[in-house]
Interface confidence: low
């Protein structure tokens, strides 16, 4: 496609010069005469048109091998200096030079902004030889130009170790404004000022910016890009975008949502994962964060008991993981549990409360009045005790654990017996004679084994001794257990 071409210099009148193939043979006029006429349209070049005097890089005149004739300086002919076209159009431009035939192996390379253009570019070089000179036309074409094609293009020719450089051809690809910075989504505090930035470039310049809030323009007068919009505060969510205008038209940025930070929504789905006698492991699903990161959470625990004083225990924890092990609870108790979380704005409401229970605990006291005596005729030891005064939280008594340790010279042996909850006495076989038997008893519930009673010792004599006196734990509050032998 032929594109709009505009020169920065004044255009020349149209000159219908001879076509390639009927080249001028007057070398002097061809290479070094000052310009007389010859407008050079952007996409049409004739190698025979005289160029305007060249002030750039030229090859110095050389003496021929015969030494009889000076050759004039070599220079690329002037061509269009500035091509302006719209994005996605095609463009073709060229540079031309006439080279005396005494120079061999001339090649032309294209350069853009100081870098050689290699590879898959549409560059074509055509040679039109005559008796003494060869006209060379190097064409460069770009299909569907983009902004990245903007720049200064030159031809270079190496000849006898000299470098000849053409005038630059500046390609300016114009299009709709292109955003280099668009507004970003933000979460802001209510009624607090914030800035949004929008920047767009051409060409063509200038680019003017209008700001849009919720589909309505905010500024009546456009601002030159870049533009910073200072919003002194919002009370509700808004969507902002910016419009960039230039002579080619309008581009609209993405719309960005400006959210107003608020307190979080309450957590949901509070769940019980594990209960023990004195702890409950809970988890929850966080609510909406109110456009501000969670900072921490608070687990609130109320005992559900008509006799409790209704106080709330509060346990603070980090916002993640969304789990917490509540400790220091009473055994076999019912609790109501809620969770609240906070962000920089404040605390959420409490989640829906859930009910949870701790399991039975182990007994907290040992059986009382433990007595032990030897029944020699049966070769066993009788043990008696009183049921401990366990609290409700310890749960239901399931039995007792009896520990008896037998010690004689060089021997120590511990045995454990389990008896049912209805018993308050037990008999154990004598394991060793001429030895000491130490007895301790603990109450057992589903929650575990309680503390053992203080030890009661009895001496088991060798066969033949008779002693029926019992050993017993003292009444509560007394000193060490008494051993009677």
């Amino acid at each position: 496609a032929i594109t709009e071409a505009r020169e920065e210099a004044k255009p020349y009148p149209l000159f219908p010069g001879p076509l390639p193939g009927s080249l001028q043979t007057d070398h002097t006029s061809l290479l070094s005469l000052p310009h007389t006429s010859g407008y050079q349209p952007a996409l049409m070049f004739s190698p025979t048109q005289p160029g305007r005097p060249y002030t750039g890089n030229v090859a110095i005149p050389r003496v021929t091998s015969a030494g009889s004739k000076l050759l004039p300086p070599l220079a690329f002919k002037h061509t269009v200096g500035h091509i302006i076209l719209s994005e996605h159009k095609d463009v073709k431009f060229n540079c031309s030079i006439s080279v005396p035939n005494i120079y061999q192996d001339t090649t032309i390379s294209w350069w853009k902004d100081g870098k050689e253009l290699l590879g898959a570019h549409h560059a074509i070089t055509q040679f039109y030889p005559d008796d003494e000179v060869t006209a060379i036309i190097a064409s460069f074409s770009i299909t569907s130009v983009q902004r990245s094609d903007n720049g200064s293009y030159i031809c270079k020719m190496k000849i006898n170790n000299e470098e000849i450089v053409s005038d630059p051809i500046y390609i300016e690809v114009q299009g709709l404004p292109h955003f280099t910075k668009q507004p970003e989504s933000m979460n802001v505090t209510r009624n607090t000022a914030f800035n949004l930035t929008c920047q767009a470039v051409g060409p063509p310049e200038p680019v003017n910016i209008f700001w849009v809030q919720n589909s309505s323009r905010v500024n009546e007068q456009p601002e030159k890009s870049p533009s910073v919009l200072t919003v002194p505060g919002l009370t509700e969510m808004a969507v902002f975008s910016c419009e960039a205008h230039n002579d080619k038209g309008l581009t609209v940025s993405k719309g960005v949502q400006i959210n107003i930070k608020a307190i979080p929504s309450p957590p949901t789905e509070v769940s019980i994962h594990n209960s023990t006698a004195h702890s409950i492991l809970i988890s929850w699903v966080p609510g909406f964060d109110g456009y501000s990161p969670f900072r921490n959470c608070s687990v609130q625990v109320k005992e559900v008991d008509p006799l409790s004083n209704g106080s709330v225990m509060i346990f603070n924890t980090s916002a993640s993981p969304h789990m917490y092990q509540i400790k220091q609870l009473q055994a076999l108790a019912n609790y109501s549990i809620g969770v609240s979380c906070m962000n920089e704005i404040g605390w959420s409401a409490v989640s829906p409360w859930i009910l949870a229970s701790t399991t039975e605990g182990a007994p907290s006291v040992a059986p009382l009045n433990v007595t032990v005596f030897l029944n020699e005729s049966r070769d066993n030891v009788d043990i008696r005790w009183m049921k401990p005064l366990t609290k409700r939280q310890a749960g239901e008594l399931v039995g007792y654990r009896i520990s008896h340790v037998w010690q004689s010279a060089g021997i120590s042996k511990e045995l454990l017996e389990e008896v049912g909850q209805n018993n308050s006495r037990a008999q154990i076989s004598v394991q060793v004679h001429n030895a000491t038997c130490t007895v301790r008893i603990a109450a057992v519930t589903k929650g575990g084994v309680g503390p053992f009673s203080d030890p009661v010792k009895i001496f088991i004599p060798a066969h033949g001794w008779v002693d029926h006196a019992p050993s017993s734990t003292p009444a509560p509050g007394n000193a060490d257990p008494v051993l009677i032998i």
């Epitope: 009624n191 607090t192 000022a193 700001w211 809030q213 919720n214 589909s215 309505s216 323009r217 905010v218 500024n219 009546e220 007068q221 919009l229 200072t230 919003v231 002194p232 505060g233 009370t235 509700e236 808004a238």
Partner: antibody
Amino acid sequence: QVQLQQPGAELVKPGASVKLSCKASGYTFTSYWMHWVKQRPGQGLEWIGMIHPNINTNYNEKFKSKATLTVDISSSTAYMQLSSLTSEDSAVYYCAKRSPYSNYDWYFDVWGTGTTVTVSS
Amino acid sequence: DIQMTQSPASLSVSVGETVTITCRASENIYSNLAWYQQKQGKSPQLLVYAATNLADGVPSRFSGSGSGTQYSLKINSLQSEDFGSYYCQHFWGTPLTFGAGTKLELK
């Protein structure tokens, strides 16, 4: 030139409501925020809130349950309804247009003539 | 909310004198301040915006200054038409708030 026309006076009974109007002319109504300001006799100025015909409303928390701002774009008129009126609501109510100098500079280059609301049985 | 404290509450002055009215904000308002004049029974009129800029048609004897939290309005060589009430107003976020006003009376 830019004008904001308001009726001169309204007499209303306690507990009733009143709807004040502010007719704009001389500028693009849909491009500017319209603000409402209260002035009790012999007192200072209190900002009630503002409305943008295409964007949203923004109220002073103090007046949120008292005032409701609306617009009729077809007639370039802004309205403020005041509800559950008491003697405390007796005042001059002004509408005011924000200045065109920049986007969010909420000061007022044009004020309405003001409507005097008297709440009396 | 940002509080605007204006002083003095009233001022008795003669024609030709110079007066200064001050306004203090409860926090930094970054020069987002306007001054208005109101005459008895009339609507307020904008005098100064953005702390220092004179509104269209305002005589040059009026000038605004200040930054941060402290602002002032100065009237040089007071004229008879300058008597009335003066209000400052911040526009650094909402709610917008006004000073309580300064009443300028003829001595």
